[in-house]
């Protein structure tokens, strides 16, 4: 169900239209639902979710992660710096979400929904950000070569990469959700 169209909204016709913050919140939760479904398929298909060899594959990936310097943690919280980090991180995740597109059999549509919903989330957040100049967009050429490199990995590494992308994306979204609710 697309965000804003769940049964709760139908059951409360008196409800005001969603605010920008509520829309963003709902969108993140919708994407997290999608990730959850994709992780189920990944974990059922292989033993990657219990694997202790994650570090091997993690070295090849430069997945966005929240750190204290990004202004999203309570200590040193900075709304604008944090918003820039969230948008930049999501833009950096896009190439990895593209990689996921051919990695699922029964959840192919779910993988596409996560990708498209993330694009919408980025648009919502860009409207909220004041300092759009500080947002660096990833280089398309670099992304294309990264995608080629990831797709050329052996089966085991591709399974591990899929697992790591989903796990890291979930964590990044949760950190973002937490920070956005403090704004």
């Amino acid at each position: 169900v697309p965000p804003g169209e769940d049964s709760k909204d139908v059951a409360a016709p008196h409800r005001q239209p969603l605010t920008s913050s509520e829309r963003i919140d709902k969108q993140i939760r919708y994407i997290l639902d999608g990730i959850s479904a994709l992780r189920k398929e990944t974990c059922n298909k292989s033993n990657m979710c219990e694997s202790s060899k994650e570090a091997l594959a993690e070295n090849n990936l430069n997945l966005p992660k929240m750190a204290e310097k990004d202004g999203c943690f309570q200590s040193g919280f900075n709304e604008e710096t944090c918003l820039v980090k969230i948008i930049t991180g999501l833009l950096e995740f896009e190439v990895y979400l593209e990689y996921l597109q051919n990695r699922f059999e029964s959840s192919e549509e779910q993988a596409r929904a996560v990708q498209m919903s993330t694009k919408v989330l980025i648009q919502f957040l860009q409207k909220k950000a004041k300092n759009l100049d500080a947002i660096t967009t990833p280089d398309p050429t670099t992304n294309a070569s990264l995608l080629t490199k990831l797709q050329a990995q052996n089966q085991w590494l591709q399974d591990m990469t899929t697992h790591l992308i989903l796990r890291s994306f979930k964590e990044f979204l949760q950190s973002s959700l937490r920070a956005l609710r403090q704004m």
């Epitope: 709760k8 605010t19 509520e22 919140d25 939760r29 997290l32 959850s36 929240m66 943690f73 309570q74 200590s75 796990r167 979930k170 964590e171 949760q174 950190s175 959700l177 937490r178 609710r181 403090q182």
Partner: antibody, heavy 119, light 106 residues
Framework: QVTLKESGPTLVKPTQTLTLTCSFS??????????VGWVRQPPGKALEWLAF???????YYSPSLESRLTITKDTSKNQVVLTMTNMDPVDTATYYC??????????????WGQGTLVT | DIQMTQSPSSLSAFVGDGVTMTCWAS??????LNWYHQRPGEAPELLVF???NLQIGVPSRFRGSGSETYFTLTINSLQPEDSGTYFC?????????FGGGTKLEI
């Protein structure tokens, strides 16, 4: 099975520092979405939230007590420690640690320790 | 800070009755509202999270509803073990805040 247990002194003198340890099992504090919080309850009164620590070491404190509180975690030992400086008789309460763990960060405490009464 | 106000502060009812208690938030918290039940001398127990989701193991006679600033907890067909104090909690943002509680006597 998820369990949490608070330990620490039952009696503290005014101006002293209280150190409480929450030892837990059945979950990992390195899993995203997971956090541990401290809540206290003076005798016959309502619950009061004190502090919270997340899987990624982000920490939050009650604004009225922030200057006196420190929360830390030791993921390998499955422990969370709360220290509260400059204790006063009004801090007499049962102190609970509790777990929060869900994808959407509802900050709902689904499992609680038995509590420890500090006087 | 988001203030949470509960009403009534106490109520009494008979076994088999139904009761409703309310919780107000001083600003919109979407559906980030949790309900707890506490018996004397025991730790609180999570009943409802995210305004309307029953925690696993909680009987279906409990029902949470509401959104934004107004929330209710309804208990149908009261049982003796339902006595105690009910607390609502803001789960939207920090600082986390609890309501003052509703004491239920059966």
């Amino acid at each position: 099975q998820v369990t949490l247990k608070e330990s620490g002194p039952t009696l503290v003198k005014p101006t002293q520092t209280l150190t409480l340890t929450c030892s837990f099992s059945g979950f990992s504090l390195s899993t995203s979405g997971v956090g541990v919080g401290w809540v206290r309850q003076p005798p016959g009164k309502a619950l009061e939230w004190l502090a919270f620590i997340f899987w990624d070491d982000d920490k939050y404190y009650s604004p009225s007590l922030e200057s006196r509180l420190t929360i830390t975690k030791d993921t390998s030992k499955n422990q969370v420690v709360l220290t509260m400086t400059n204790m006063d008789p009004v801090d007499t309460a049962t102190y609970y640690c509790a777990r929060s763990a869900d994808d959407y960060l509802y900050y709902s405490f689904d499992t609680w320790g038995q509590g420890t009464l500090v006087t | 800070d988001i203030q949470m106000t509960q009403s009534p502060s106490s109520l009494s009812a008979f076994v088999g009755d139904g009761v409703t208690m309310t919780c107000w938030a001083s600003q919109s918290i979407n559906d980030y509202l949790n309900w707890y039940h506490q018996r004397p001398g025991e730790a609180p127990e999570l009943l409802v999270f995210a305004a309307s989701n029953l925690q696993i193991g909680v009987p279906s006679r409990f029902r949470g509803s509401g959104s934004e600033t107004y929330f209710t907890l309804t208990i149908n067909s009261l049982q003796p073990e339902d006595s105690g104090t009910y607390f609502c909690q803001n789960g939207h943002s920090f600082p986390l805040t609890f309501g003052g509680g509703t004491k239920l006597e059966i």
